[in-house]
Interface confidence: low
Amino acid sequence: SERCDDWGLDTMRQIQVFEDEPARIKCPLFEHFLKFNYSTAHSAGLTLIWYWTRQDRDLEEPINFRLPENRISKEKDVLWFRPTLLNDTGNYTCMLRNTTYCSKVAFPLEVVQKDSCFNSPMKLPVHKLYIEYGIQRITCPNVDGYFPSSVKPTITWYMGCYKIQNFNNVIPEGMNLSFLIALISNNGNYTCVVTYPENGRTFHLTRTLTVKVVGSPKNAVPPVIHSPNDHVVYEKEPGEELLIPCTVYFSFLMDSRNEVWWTIDGKKPDDITIDVTINESISHSRTEDETRTQILSIKKVTSEDLKRSYVCHARSAKGEVAKAAKVKQKVPAPRYTVELACGFGAT
């Protein structure tokens, strides 16, 4: 057949859906690849065609839109499953074409099973709540477009396996779940189950997200350099290994990029000729405050190296700080020699 602009398999959009639940999947062409929307394409005489490759198969085949209960259907640029089955897993392709134009993209769809406590291989979105910050809400995600606004679904919220009712500081409010004052004990997986009727049938949408209680911006401070500091002097002899840790504490800040780096004589280590290695480790507190440690290492230090300026720098959205390490060459200890006079002896 004639050439088609093939965008390949769009693995960035790995779609996961639960078994036996409705799923609506928009053709990614209009969202990420083409500069026009479905309506424009449709009015220009372009047709959207769907097909798929089953899991562990190479054969592309048309999607069966003739299943009982209209289980799989297409509406504009959306592929509908009402509901999904486990063996719907595979790579789906949407192709937009007419006699002169063709463009297509494939994407993976994985239908996953969940247990009675909503555990599954599903990758969960994480919602961060500030600790002791006042009322904050999470909203049941990705339920738009499944039912008209005239339909009033029932929504049940769970924390882990337990239905949320009479929880101290967590209140279900329809599609929202409100946290009065979030505490570390509120960390966990929260699930909303949305139940709605459609043409005499009842459907369920299950959406789970992870809540992580993090440091409040009220308590955020600029980076704090714990090491190097004024109390520690790195005294080395030429030929010894020089190890200087730079340890920095960062308050949690939403979407802040935390950076730590060393300069040697005002230059980045990569820009100078000495043999330096830098190893970084990162640890987090329960509220996601971060401690970064970068250890600067020179295996065999020279007397020139011991005269250089070693400065640790740190930056976050709250500010930038720097601290120089105190490095010096060890002064050799004086040699005490004892000369014994001759001629003393017993006669």
Partner: antibody, heavy 113, light 110 residues
Framework: SVEESGGRLVTPGTPLTLTCTVS????????INWVRQAPGKGLEWIGY??????TYCASWAKGRFTISKTSSTTVDLKITSLTTEDTATYFC??????????WGQGTLVTVSS | AQVLTQTASSVSATVGGTVTISCQSS????????LSWYQQKPGQPPKLLIY???TLASGVPLRFSGSGSGTQFTLTISGVQSDDAATYYC??????????FGGGTEVVVK
């Protein structure tokens, strides 16, 4: 609910149309099956009409049986040239979640000379 | 064409006892689980008991259970009651979009 009508006593060779009337069911997104049961015998699937008016029939029923949607609330089963073998109670049933979950009471068709 | 076989045409049960009815399909049902069970009493339409092999239909007592996958399925009635006297049918739905019914098993409660 679903309700069948149109069953009666007919002579062999006569055509007959049975009607399934639904209420509270949207035929644009719900399928309707026809099933029959000869006196004292088991259930026999005839066919199905789904969303988009797509019809499926059992291989034995093709040709002589036609299923069609006649309004937003009715589905017809047309049988041409009835034989005594077609004597049965004819049920219509909605496709539920992978099964026929809502049945009518049935309508009796008797073919006799 | 698919053939659904219910080996026993009739089984006898005592009140409080357990009955199992088997259903074998000549080929795998759709998604390996599109097998349903129906109860029919004389003069009445069939009533859905179990769908997708093991899911209990709304309002059906817990003493009914279904199991199986692919081609072999079982309906179990635990703690049989006199009201369970009826004929039970299995039905399979297939990739070909056909529906097949088993021949039925009559449960006689003594």
């Amino acid at each position: 609910s679903v309700e069948e009508s149109g069953g009666r006593l007919v002579t062999p060779g006569t055509p007959l149309t049975l009607t399934c009337t639904v209420s509270g069911i949207d035929l644009n997104s719900n399928g309707i099956n026809w099933v029959r049961q000869a006196p004292g015998k088991g259930l026999e699937w005839i066919g199905y009409i789904g969303a988009g008016d797509i019809t499926y029939c059992a291989s034995w029923a093709k040709g002589r049986f036609t299923i069609s949607k006649t309004s937003s609330t009715t589905v017809d089963l047309k049988i041409t040239s009835l034989t005594t073998e077609d004597t049965a109670t004819y049920f219509c049933a909605r496709w539920g979640p992978g099964a026929l979950d809502l049945w009518g009471q049935g309508t009796l068709v008797t073919v006799s000379s | 064409a698919q053939v659904l076989t219910q080996t026993a045409s009739s089984v006898s049960a005592t009140v409080g006892g357990t009955v199992t009815i088997s259903c074998q399909s000549s080929q795998s049902v759709y998604n390996n689980n599109y097998l349903s069970w129906y109860q029919q009493k004389p003069g009445q339409p069939p009533k859905l008991l179990i769908y997708k092999a093991s899911t209990l239909a709304s309002g059906v007592p817990l003493r009914f259970s279904g199991s199986g996958s692919g081609t072999q399925f079982t309906l179990t009635i635990s703690g049989v009651q006199s009201d369970d006297a009826a004929t039970y049918y299995c039905a399979g739905f297939y990739e070909t979009t056909d529906v097949g019914f088993g021949g039925g098993t009559e449960v006689v409660v003594k």
